[in-house]
Interface confidence: medium
């Protein structure tokens, strides 16, 4: 059962797994959610009635019954992990904590103009988990404006103390705000010879990489495959770090694979969701339950529905036994990974899908697309929306993309002459415009947010957000697309598509069926040559064939330029402008979305921020951001 509210002056008795320090009860709840075993927690707030050494302690707890006895205690705040809930979860924490010093290893000290600059420095430093910044009012003159970058083994502070005139906060890597590059390759026959911070068992290098990505100290990893000569090390995933942040030595070894943490682009990759099945593979661990199941898929469902189940092994039924049902072994361990992996015993193993909600909804695999043809099929581009105006009569105005459960990203130039959001309607899950009747459900627009530097499409900043009046329930036909990661700025996208109901040629009409065209990206240098009279800036991206013939056109504006990278679709561009349509040597010009990620996050969160008073949170006064962008969903 999902319980989101916090229980004030309440302490859960027993069930302790470990104690960490967090600056708030809300963050304690997030830490509990991301911990492999934590189901409940008790946080101790700052209070005169409590021993100061116990302030800010966050005790993570587990219970076979999923609950524990409650005891009244002043300053204690208790609650449940979000593992039991179905909504999206995010580790992103933008809050700044005033007069708190979060202790850790201070590995870097420098002068910064503001706490925001200090936080940005932390976000762009590979080792940084959190920071403390001494403000201008700090009593000690030589420490004023000093930004301390910190890290710990767990990613959370080793202690938190009260300290006047300092502020503290966390790295925003998990908010998709890091400029650190993502090295997505997995290198075969390679061992990284650096210090191991941890080791777990994993069925393949991809799972090992995902474990590394969400492990606070892991910067890169080495995985020994099941063919590795040393039996005791088979399926071993070594989580590694180094002072420089890079592997110091690569050793060539057959049957080993190595790669990097993708922490700075984790919003656009599945990290917790290990959805594959591993055949002829047994996962060992603590047994939770043994139940009969018809198939390994059914066994995975049972594991997903059992809140404490982390992974499973299914042994298919012998021909005539048990009505064709096999045995489903539901299992768990201290770290969420099998304690050993065995092969050749006929089992089929896998992981719970309960943790998939900790990944961005936009990373969910969509149905395979139909290659060839120009007309799309239903569900092929589930983030594509059609934006209608009702004035003077109802018509398709522009395209747009779902990027969050209340947010559409589109082009600013679509709103020329649009006086009020009241005349706008957003239709999602639409393939044919003819489906839209008077009674077709739509989303009203609460607010139009146009980039304040926008003047005209050709001069850039052609980007706008629509805040919807109601939230989108994600289904196969309507779901978000991932924003590109700032860490992926150097990625060369090769599988890009433009979609829309726009004209197929100049002097045409809006198409009934959603059209699609695969279009290659063009370098900005090349694009600039084709548009001598315009300035093609780094905030624009161009796409098109030299010979013309395929392009976005009138009515496609605001729609997506969607590129598939590592099995995940990214919103690389927003259809903006071009000379004619599909003309020879005149590529289409798109808003380069990666350059606006900060702006998007700032706008989508500014609308949501509200101050929660001291009374609301039992003595904690701070800013809580209720994020609902696709990688910052409502709690």
């Amino acid at each position: 059962e999902c319980v989101t509210q916090l229980l004030k002056d309440t302490c859960f008795e027993g069930g302790d797994i470990t104690t960490v320090f967090t600056p708030s009860a809300k963050y304690c709840q997030v830490v509990c959610t991301y911990h492999p075993r934590c189901l409940l927690f008790t946080f101790t707030a700052e209070s005169p009635s409590e021993d100061p050494t116990r302030w800010f302690t966050c005790v993570l707890k587990d219970s076979v019954t999923e609950t524990l006895p409650r005891v009244n205690r002043t300053a204690a705040i208790s609650g449940y992990s979000f593992k039991q809930c179905s909504h999206q979860i995010s580790a992103c924490n933008k809050d700044i904590y005033v007069d708190l010093d979060m202790k850790g290893i201070n590995y870097n000290s420098s002068v910064a103009k503001s706490a925001q600059e200090c936080q940005e420095r932390c976000t762009d430093d590979v080792h940084c988990h959190f920071f403390t910044y001494a403000t201008r009012q700090f009593p000690s003159l030589e420490h004023r404006n000093i930004c301390l970058l910190k890290h710990t083994q767990t990613g959370t502070p080793t202690r938190i103390t009260k300290l006047d005139k300092v502020v503290s906060g966390f790295s925003l890597k998990s908010c998709a705000l890091s400029n650190l590059a993502c090295i997505r390759d997995i290198f075969p026959n390679t061992v990284f010879a650096d210090s191991n911070i941890d080791s777990v068992m994993a069925p393949d290098a991809f799972v090992c990489g995902r474990i590394c990505t969400h492990h606070p100290g892991c910067l890169f990893f080495t995985f020994f495959s099941q063919e590795w000569p040393k039996e005791s090390q088979r399926n071993l995933c070594l989580l590694k770090t180094s002072e420089s942040g890079l592997p110091s030595t690569r050793i060539k070894k057959s049957k080993a694979l190595s790669g990097f943490s993708l922490q700075s682009c984790r919003h656009s990759i599945p990290v917790f969701c290990h959805s594959s099945f591993y055949h002829d593979t047994d996962f060992l661990g603590e047994e939770l339950d043994i139940v009969a199941a018809k198939s390994h898929e059914a066994c995975q469902k049972l594991c997903t529905n059992a809140v404490r189940c982390q992974f499973f092994t299914y042994t298919p039924a012998q021909a005539s036994c048990n009505e064709g049902k096999g045995k489903c072994y539901l299992k768990l361990s201290s770290n969420g990974s099998p304690t050993k992996i065995l092969h050749g015993r006929g089992g089929i193993s896998g992981y719970t899908l309960r943790l998939c909600k900790m990944d961005n909804e936009c990373t969910t695999k969509i149905k395979p697309r139909i290659v060839g043809g120009t007309a799309s099929v239903r569900g092929e581009w589930p983030w594509q929306v059609t934006l209608h105006t009702t004035s003077p009569t109802q018509r398709h105005l522009c395209g747009g993309s779902i990027i969050g459960n209340q947010w559409i990203l589109t082009a600013a130039h679509c709103f020329y002459g649009v006086e009020s959001p009241k005349i706008l309607r957003v239709y999602s899950g639409i393939l044919n415009q003819s489906e839209i009747k008077e009674d077709t459900s739509f989303f009203g627009v609460q607010e139009i947010i146009i980039h304040d530097q926008y003047k005209m499409a050709e001069s850039g900043y052609d980007i706008a957000l629509l805040k919807l009046e109601t939230t989108v329930n994600y289904t196969d036909s309507q779901r978000p697309i991932c924003l590109p990661s700032k860490g992926d700025r150097n990625v060369i996208y090769t599988d890009c598509w433009v979609t829309g109901w726009g004209y197929r040629k100049l002097r045409d009409k809006i198409q009934n069926t959603l059209q699609k065209a695969k279009i290659p990206l063009v370098t900005n240098e090349e694009c600039q040559k084709r548009y001598r009279g315009h300035k093609i800036t780094h905030k624009m991206i161009c796409a098109g064939y030299r010979e013309g013939g395929k392009d976005a056109c009138k009515g496609d504006s605001g729609g997506p330029l969607s590129c598939k990278h590592n099995e995940v679709w990214h919103l690389v561009g927003i259809t903006s402008w071009g000379e004619g349509c599909a003309q020879r040597e005149r590529p289409g010009v798109y808003t380069n979305v990666v350059e606006y990620v900060d702006w998007i996050l700032e706008k989508t969160q500014a609308v949501e921020q509200k101050l929660i008073s001291e009374e609301d949170l039992g003595g904690e006064q701070k800013l809580i951001s209720e994020e609902d962008l696709h990688h910052h969903h409502h709690h």
């Epitope: 090295i183 592997p247 030595t249 050793i251 060539k252 070894k253 150097n490």
Partner: antibody, heavy 119, light 108 residues
Framework: QVQLVESGGGVVQPGRSLRLSCAAS????????MHWVRQTPGKGLEWVAL????????YSGDSVKGRFTISRDNSKSTLYLQMNSLTAEDTAVYYC????????????WGQGTMVTVSS | DIQMTQSPSSLSASVGDRVTITCRAS??????LNWYQQKPGKAPKLLIY???SLQSGVPSRFSGSGSGTDFTLTISSLQPEDFATYYC??????????FGQGTRLEIK
């Protein structure tokens, strides 16, 4: 065909700087790891520095660490070696080389550019 | 760092001879060893990679063998164009990448 062309060599005084360039053509430069290797007159080959295909990882040999910086511009298909605080021991022919095959072997080489450090 | 030692450092041979050059690594490098040929005033050229695989375009009279610490380059029947300096190089533990000191093959 695959080609690497170095430039920027010459005579320079000790303590001064020099920047070598290597222009690549005939292959997708941005996909491959690139290196600089040098050869002092009448001597053997010495590895100098490497850079990963996307510029994310850079390494250099102990003898040049902190003085030489390898970089690349994939949009120009060009590799660079910025050499600072040069000494007489840095006098050598500098080769730009790459690994384009599946094995870690230098299968493409430039013709080399001579750097002479002398007062 | 892994040290590579070649022997001999120079050798004289005649056209048609069978020639063997050896290379020893200071620790096991599996089969991550490459051989290069260099002619005066020219850049090195890859002959053999992964200890025994012949690079495309290289005549079949060149062959490589060995694994662990001991490797050999063999030229089965020396041709006039084979007189050059030969280098071995390990790609097992990198960086640094290390080369042997070279073997100069000259006409007797």
């Amino acid at each position: 065909q695959v080609q690497l062309v170095e430039s920027g060599g010459g005579v320079v005084q000790p303590g001064r700087s020099l920047r070598l360039s290597c222009a690549a053509s005939g292959f997708t430069f941005s996909n491959y790891e690139m290196h600089w290797v040098r050869q002092t007159p009448g001597k053997g080959l010495e590895w100098v520095a490497l850079i990963w295909y996307d510029g994310s990882n850079k390494y250099s040999g102990d003898s040049v660490k902190g003085r030489f910086t390898i970089s690349r511009d994939n949009s120009k298909s060009t590799l660079y070696l910025q050499m600072n605080s040069l000494t007489a021991e840095d006098t050598a022919v500098y080769y730009c080389t790459g690994i384009t095959g599946t094995e870690d072997a230098f299968d493409v080489w430039g013709q080399g550019t001579m750097v002479t450090v002398s007062s | 760092d892994i040290q590579m030692t070649q022997s001999p450092s120079s050798l004289s041979a005649s056209v048609g001879d069978r020639v063997t050059i050896t290379c020893r690594a200071s620790q096991s490098i599996s089969s991550y060893l490459n051989w290069y040929q260099q002619k005066p005033g020219k850049a090195p050229k890859l002959l053999i990679y992964a200890a025994s695989s012949l690079q495309s375009g290289v005549p079949s009279r060149f062959s490589g063998s060995g694994s662990g610490t001991d490797f050999t380059l063999t030229i089965s029947s020396l041709q006039p164009e084979d007189f050059a300096t030969y280098y071995c190089q390990q790609s097992y533990s990198t960086p640094p990448i290390t080369f042997g000191q070279g073997t100069r093959l000259e006409i007797k």
